[in-house]
């Protein structure tokens, strides 16, 4: 028997459900109380799902796993995990057997957007030319660890006196407090892009200060 | 005919671990989940976990996860329970049992004594 | 986990008596079986998929149930099954057993 699953890793939003895809090819007058099916954690093989003696075994996982039962005979051996969390990434390994076995790996990539980024400043009036302000970029709930750019109102990078801290919560989920430390010019822009590197997801902020009121 | 075989007695201290071996004969080894129960003295079965010899697939009563380690050697048809820091309240005898549709094959168990 | 309640917890029966023993799951399960375990001996495989009867059981005895409630009967008791019987579930993990009902004879 020949166990396939897909190279790419299965990319999941945090709350929705994901389907780890896995196929084999019955043979003519295949019958599931042949099938011998195990979903586990490749790294400690921990059960995860598992269909026996023409029978599914249910789930080993947080009750949160399910096949497709109605697919199993066709070759689809795919499992179904609901309500994804962090904690679920990683990678899975679907373990077929029927008189011979095969076995493949497939990797769960848990991704979460992150919010779009609210600025405050420190100091926020009395503002001069040359005064030295702190800008802070903060953004909540993503996930996996963010990346942070600073740019100026052209665009140019801003690399130094830059300090990132990012925070995960018990959900496993990152906040991300960047601060930017600049010496003001007569008028600037400074924005702040929040990257989520797995769903290639930007969120922008920027605070605009000019002589007038400040402009977020 | 289907055989478990488990040593008769082990004798450990407090504090040890202790290896539980299973042999099983007469069946194709790698194609039925191994169960590991525990009992102890005049009380009833506790499950403590599961692996599947071919995947190597286990599965933890969370009460005995960070006591108990199960593993299996294919090529001598042998399942193990190491059983770590060992306590009183481990003495019990331990059975491993073939499953198929039920728990159809049991040991006759090795009985642990953990005394000084 | 799903706790399974035996009763009685003990019992006594008389030879040609009729026996039955129930067992109460904390939450719906698809099959109970159930295990006979004699002192210093092994348990034995008894009864499957709530009604089945494992192979070289008596007919005298069946199994019944769904949901939460489940049973072993023996329809006329014998010296020889005298022991304890214990219930178990497989349809959530971890597996369970229950805490056993000893059936003495009268």
């Known amino acids: 028997v020949e166990v396939q699953v897909s190279e790419d890793p299965v990319v999941a939003l945090v709350d929705t459900d994901a389907t780890l895809r896995c196929s084999f090819s019955p043979e003519p007058g295949f019958s599931l109380a042949q099938l011998n099916l195990i979903w586990q954690l490749t790294d400690t093989k921990q059960l995860v799902h598992s269909f026996t003696e023409g029978r599914d075994q249910g789930s080993a996982y947080s009750n949160r796993t399910a096949l497709f039962p109605d697919l199993l005979v066709q070759g689809n051996a795919s499992l179904r995990l609901q309500r994804v969390r962090v904690t679920d990434e990683g990678s899975y390994t679907c373990f077929v057997s029927i008189q011979d076995f095969d076995s493949a790996a497939v990797s769960l990539q848990v991704a979460a957007p992150y919010s779009k980024p609210s600025m405050t400043l420190e100091p926020n009036k009395d503002l001069r030319p040359g005064n030295m302000v702190t800008i802070t970029c903060s953004s909540y709930q993503g996930y996996p660890e963010a990346e942070v750019f600073w740019k100026d109102g052209q665009g140019v990078p801003l690399t130094g006196n830059v300090t990132t801290s990012q925070m995960a919560n018990e959900r496993g989920l990152f906040d991300v407090h960047s601060v930017l430390r600049v010496v003001l010019g007569a008028n600037g822009t400074y924005s702040c892009l929040v990257r989520n590197p797995v769903l290639q997801q930007d969120a922008h902020g920027s605070v605009t200060i000019t002589g007038q009121p400040l402009t977020f | 005919q289907v055989q478990l075989q488990q040593p008769g007695a082990e004798l450990v201290k407090p504090g040890a671990s202790v290896k539980l071996s299973c042999k099983a004969s007469?069946?194709?080894?790698?194609?039925?989940?191994m169960h590991w129960v525990k009992q102890r003295p005049g009380q009833g079965l506790e499950w403590i976990g599961m692996?599947?010899?071919?995947?190597?697939?286990?599965n933890y009563n969370e009460k005995f996860k960070s006591k108990a380690t199960l593993t299996v050697d294919k090529s001598s048809s042998t399942a193990y329970m190491q059983l770590s820091s060992l306590t009183s309240e481990d003495s019990a005898v331990y059975y491993c049992?073939?499953?198929?549709?039920?728990?159809?094959?049991w040991g006759q168990g090795t009985t642990l004594t953990v005394s000084s | 986990q799903i706790v399974l309640t035996q009763s009685p917890a003990i019992m006594s029966a008389s030879p040609g008596e009729k026996v039955t023993m129930t067992c109460s799951a904390s939450?719906?399960?698809?099959?109970m079986h159930w295990y006979q375990q004699k002192p210093g001996t092994s348990p034995k495989r008894w009864i499957y998929?709530?009604?089945k009867l494992a192979s070289g059981v008596p007919a005298r005895f069946s199994g019944s149930g769904s949901g939460t409630s489940y049973s072993l009967t023996i329809s006329s008791m014998e010296a020889e099954d005298a022991a304890t019987y214990y219930c178990?579930?497989?349809?959530?993990?971890?597996?369970?057993f229950g805490a056993g009902t000893k059936l003495e004879l009268k």
């Open positions: 049992a073939r499953e198929s549709r039920q728990l159809d094959y």
């Open positions: 007469g069946y194709t080894f790698t194609s039925y989940w």
């Open positions: 692996i599947h010899p071919n995947s190597g697939s286990t």
């Open positions: 939450s719906s399960i698809s099959y």
């Open positions: 998929d709530t009604s």
């Open positions: 178990h579930q497989r349809s959530s993990y971890p597996l369970t």
